[in-house]
């Protein structure tokens, strides 16, 4: 017998179904009904057939009582081929529902987003996350999904981007963005970032989070952030292959003293990088490749230092840095 | 059995930040559920944090969502209140809890805020 | 946000009676075949234990003297016969909408 495709656990929280064969029953699904966390996966399922039964313009609202009756907060939906006319027909019924976080992953978003009709409501989404998500329509696939979104969002994600790069001059500000995640995109690099980070489109932010995106110094992702205005407290730039040394040919950049926390662990550091902020909070420097303490003329002014995970650490050894955060253990790295 | 413990400071001082610790044992906090926090001034009705769920998806109430942070651990299988600026009415039993109809909770913590 | 109005506040009644207490939501707490409303037992100095689950649903441990009823806004909490150990103070709550929030307690005393 094969498995129940949905599983609803047994305090109405999460919901999970993973429909993978090729006829799928999708009313299983409505047991999802009293989920607060649901996650679909559609085992690589081309979704077109639906659009035939579906009417993908019929008016959103006759579903609105239905659709407030959902409990569900996050909604993660995987796996499948989506026509971009079905995506919109599921956002502008979702936009009555309580739906606070979306995360799509590995789909392939076919044929373009029509424009958002003038009555039609907004999803009032705090977060969204996208992983694998290819679109069709290229560089102008944020500013077709921003429309359908109020402009409240706060968290927005971006992983295995096929096209990182937006078409800037069609995106809208996002006012409330505080979180920009675009980690592991490998191929961004710096002059990707500049072309992600759209100028004056992410004045909010204080969370930035690149890792493993190509970057290559913490001058160049400085720069970056300078050209596009953004002027995060947090900026995370673990897991890339860090350069010590700057381009002596390369302007100075001066970093915005909102900064306050920079992650460079898992860099592949074999000394501290030079243009680092003056003065910062925190700064992790674990799991790299130091072989000797770091000088005190080599690191920001510094209130919390991580070096756990560096060959030169051996426990026991003196802490290097006064205020450090190393437990003396070497961690897994 | 599935088992919920707080730890943290009984006394903070007014305008500090309250930090409680709800380490859980016999169930993991990133396979299910949603792990809230449950305050009960003295003699009074009980109040609604905020969780942090299995996926770290968080939701707070309102009323306090400015000065709530809900995080997790999930190596040590702990997750964590913190509530900055406190006041003298923010003094209260504070429960760890899982789910959403709450089934298992901690004894409580008594946190004092005074000079 | 979503008041529950519990009543009465407070009751004193003898053992072997049949005790009857009333949630009363300011809203719909049913989501399509379910009702997210939930009843606790508090007694001094302890946590809150929960008696029932969605209504009418009785937690495992929890003697079957206790029962739920109710649908939408009108919900009821009854103990058939009452026993000493009944003493404490009861609470409903809805988990159908955040913010999640709980009726005022219902303090019950024997005569």
């Known amino acids: 017998t094969t498995p129940e495709p949905c599983e609803l656990d047994d305090e109405d929280f999460r919901c999970v179904c993973n429909f993978s064969e090729p006829q799928p029953d999708w009313s299983e699904a409505f047991q999802c009904v009293s989920a607060v966390e649901v996650e679909i996966h559609a085992g690589g399922l081309n979704l077109e057939p639906f659009l035939k039964r579906v009417d993908a313009d019929a008016d959103p609202r006759q579903y609105a009582d239905t659709v407030k009756a959902l409990r569900v907060r996050r909604l993660t939906v995987g796996a499948a081929q989506v026509p971009a006319q079905l995506l919109v027909g599921a956002l502008r019924v979702l936009a009555y529902s309580r739906l606070k976080e979306l995360t799509l992953e590995d789909l392939k978003i076919t044929g373009t987003m029509p424009p958002l009709p003038l009555e039609a409501t907004g999803l009032a989404l705090s977060s969204l996350r996208l992983r694998n998500v290819s679109w069709a329509t290229g560089r102008s696939w944020l500013a077709e999904l921003q429309q359908w979104l109020k402009p409240g969002l706060k968290v927005l994600s971006i992983a295995q981007a096929h096209s990182p790069a937006f078409s800037c001059e069609q995106v809208r500000a996002f006012p409330a963005l505080t979180s920009l995640d675009l980690s592991d995109n490998p191929g961004l690099g710096e002059r990707g970032l500049m072309a992600a980070l759209c100028p004056h489109k992410f004045p909010a932010i204080q969370n930035l989070a690149l890792r493993n995106t190509g970057m290559e110094t913490p001058t160049g992702v400085c720069a970056a952030l300078a050209a596009a205005g953004v002027q995060p407290h947090s900026l995370d730039l673990s897991h890339n292959s860090l350069r010590a040394t700057v381009n002596p040919s390369a302007p100075r950049c001066m970093w915005s003293s909102a900064l306050n926390s920079l992650n460079l662990s898992f860099a592949g550091l074999e000394q501290v990088p030079k243009g680092l902020p003056a003065k910062l909070r925190v700064l992790d420097l674990s799991c790299n490749r130091l072989n000797r303490a770091p000088q005190p003329d080599e690191l920001p002014e510094v209130d919390n230092l991580t070096l756990d995970g560096n060959p030169f650490l051996v426990p026991g050894t003196a802490l290097p840095h006064e205020g450090s955060m190393n437990s003396g253990v070497v961690p897994a790295c | 059995q599935l088992q919920l413990q707080e730890s943290g400071p009984g006394l903070v001082k007014p305008s500090e930040t309250l930090s409680l610790t709800c380490t859980v044992s016999?169930?993991?906090?990133?396979?299910?559920?949603?792990w809230n926090w449950i305050r009960q001034p003295p003699g009074k009705g009980l109040e609604w944090i905020g969780y942090?769920?299995?996926?770290?998806?968080?939701s707070y109430n309102p009323s306090l969502k400015s000065r709530v942070t809900i995080s997790r651990d999930t190596s040590k299988n702990q997750f964590s209140l913190k509530l900055s600026s406190v006041t003298a009415a923010d003094t209260a039993v504070y429960y760890c809890?899982?789910?959403?109809?709450?089934?298992?909770w901690g004894q409580g913590t008594l946190v004092t805020v005074s000079s | 946000d979503i008041q529950l109005t519990q009543s009465p506040s407070s009751l004193s009644a003898s053992v072997g009676d049949r005790v009857t207490i009333t949630c009363r939501a300011s809203e719909s707490v049913d989501s399509y075949v379910d009702s997210f409303l939930h009843w606790y037992q508090q007694k001094p100095g302890k946590a809150p234990k929960l008696l029932i689950y969605r209504a009418s649903n009785l937690q495992s441990g929890v003697p079957s003297r206790f029962s739920g009823s109710g649908s939408r806004t009108d919900f009821t909490l009854t103990i058939s016969s009452l026993q000493p150990e009944d003493v404490a103070t009861y609470y409903c709550?809805?988990?159908?909408?955040?913010?999640?929030?709980f009726g005022q307690g219902t303090k019950l005393e024997i005569k």
């Open positions: 942090i769920s299995y996926s770290g998806s968080t």
């Open positions: 809890v899982r789910g959403l109809r709450f089934a298992y």
């Open positions: 709550q809805q988990s159908n909408e955040d913010p999640y929030t």
């Open positions: 016999g169930g993991s906090i990133s396979s299910d559920s949603a």
